[in-house]
């Protein structure tokens, strides 16, 4: 499946757009808002009922480079004596964004969009039960 | 820009760092995922600091539709279905590159821009700064 | 679709050790979590003990800690129960149960009832 095209009828794509070959599209990877930063409140990986820890995942062909994945630490959640309590599930919270996928194919290059899941930190659950058999 | 091995065996005019402007594959890789947290999960309502989902809808953006999270308490949901105010529900946001169309409106030039959303929430001992 | 079954259960004196047993047939273990719970009559259902499978993590309730170990082995397709220490409020039927995502339990056994007697 493909990016959509304007599909709302009050857009006229204007004479200013570039030319672009067919099944491709023209990327600036020159990022808007570069030096936006995250305003989370501070260590809650840490201070978290259902606390995570980050890797950071690094791939020379990808842009960014680098994507920083959490992973929960318990499988149950922190009670308030400090312990797991596995009544309840700390699980990993998921979003998606987009990278630039680098691609050799002998000594030409071609760049590919790819959707990548990112866990971002990890909330606590009731659990749930689908089956008793 | 980011360095990348290259082939010993090509030529060396290429560039080991990414180019500023490149041309892309229109099929996106992994397209087909879920994109709506209300479908692929329900831990937005069963969390013990669980978040409404609005959505955030923008036709100059790739993908036009993006879902933000807002805590619904200050505190969290104890054992007895009650909020509790000795913790707190805090948002945990991330940074996610999307495709802005640039110029506005044309359906095949896109730029990357960062946006900061707001994925789900989760309940933390608050801090507490004491006052001498 | 994984059918679960339990065994090792029966009559044991206080201080006593059981072995429970749990086998995936018709699929594996390889899910997010694997896990124990149990009821007894009148009580709240109680899971007892978790393990994650990536890592190896796991996790008990507060009543077993110290007591219980639960363990796995991937080659022969089971998961394990190891209870020392057996007191009479261990008396349930025992359930062994998987979660193929977080904090889904999706699969059940039929239970093997463990009765602990003082």
């Known amino acids: 499946r493909k990016i959509p095209k304007v599909g709302h009828t009050f857009f006229q794509k204007p004479e200013s757009c570039p030319p672009v070959p067919g099944g491709s599209m023209k990327l600036d990877i020159g990022i808007i808002n570069e030096n936006q930063r995250v305003s989370m409140s501070r260590n809650i990986e840490s201070r978290s009922t259902s606390p995570w820890n980050y890797t950071v995942t690094w791939d020379p062909n990808r842009y960014p480079s680098e994507v920083v994945q959490a992973q929960c630490r318990n499988l149950g959640c922190i009670n308030a004596q400090g312990k797991e309590d596995i009544s309840m599930n700390s699980v990993p919270i998921q979003q998606e964004t987009l990278v630039v996928r680098r691609k050799h194919q002998g000594c030409s290059v071609s760049f590919q969009l790819e959707k990548v899941l990112v866990t971002v930190g990890c909330t606590c659950v009731t659990p749930v039960i689908h089956h008793v058999q | 820009g980011i360095t990348i091995p290259r082939n010993p065996g090509c030529p060396n005019s290429e560039d080991k760092n990414f180019p500023r402007t490149v041309m892309v594959n229109l099929n996106i890789h992994n397209r087909n995922t879920n994109t709506n947290p209300k479908r692929s999960s329900d831990y937005y309502n069963r969390s013990t600091s669980p978040w409404n989902l609005h959505r955030n809808e923008d036709p100059e953006r790739y993908p036009s539709v993006i879902w933000e999270a807002k805590c619904r308490h200050l505190g969290c949901i104890n054992a007895d279905g009650n909020v509790d105010y000795h913790m707190n529900s805090v948002p945990i946001q991330q940074e996610i590159l999307v495709l802005r169309r640039e110029p506005p409106h044309c359906p095949n030039s896109f730029r990357l821009e960062k946006i900061l959303v707001s994925v789900g929430c989760t309940c933390v001992t608050p801090i507490v700064h004491h006052v001498a | 679709e994984v059918q679960l079954v339990e065994s090792g259960g029966g009559l044991v004196q206080a201080g006593g050790s059981l072995r429970l047993s749990c086998g995936a047939s018709g699929g594996t273990f390889s899910s997010y979590a694997t896990g124990w719970f149990r009821q007894a009559p009148g009580k709240e259902r109680e899971f007892v003990a978790v393990?994650?499978?990536?890592?190896?993590?796991?996790a008990y309730a507060d009543s077993v800690k110290g007591r219980f170990t639960i363990s796995r082995d991937g080659a022969k397709n089971t998961m394990y129960l190891q209870m020392s220490s057996l007191k009479p409020e261990d008396t349930a039927i025992y359930y062994c149960?998987?979660?193929?995502?977080?904090?889904?339990?999706?699969?059940w056994g039929q239970g093997t009832q463990v009765t602990v007697s003082s």
């Open positions: 393990l994650r499978w990536s890592d190896g993590h796991t």
């Open positions: 149960t998987t979660a193929t995502r977080p904090g889904e339990w999706d699969y």
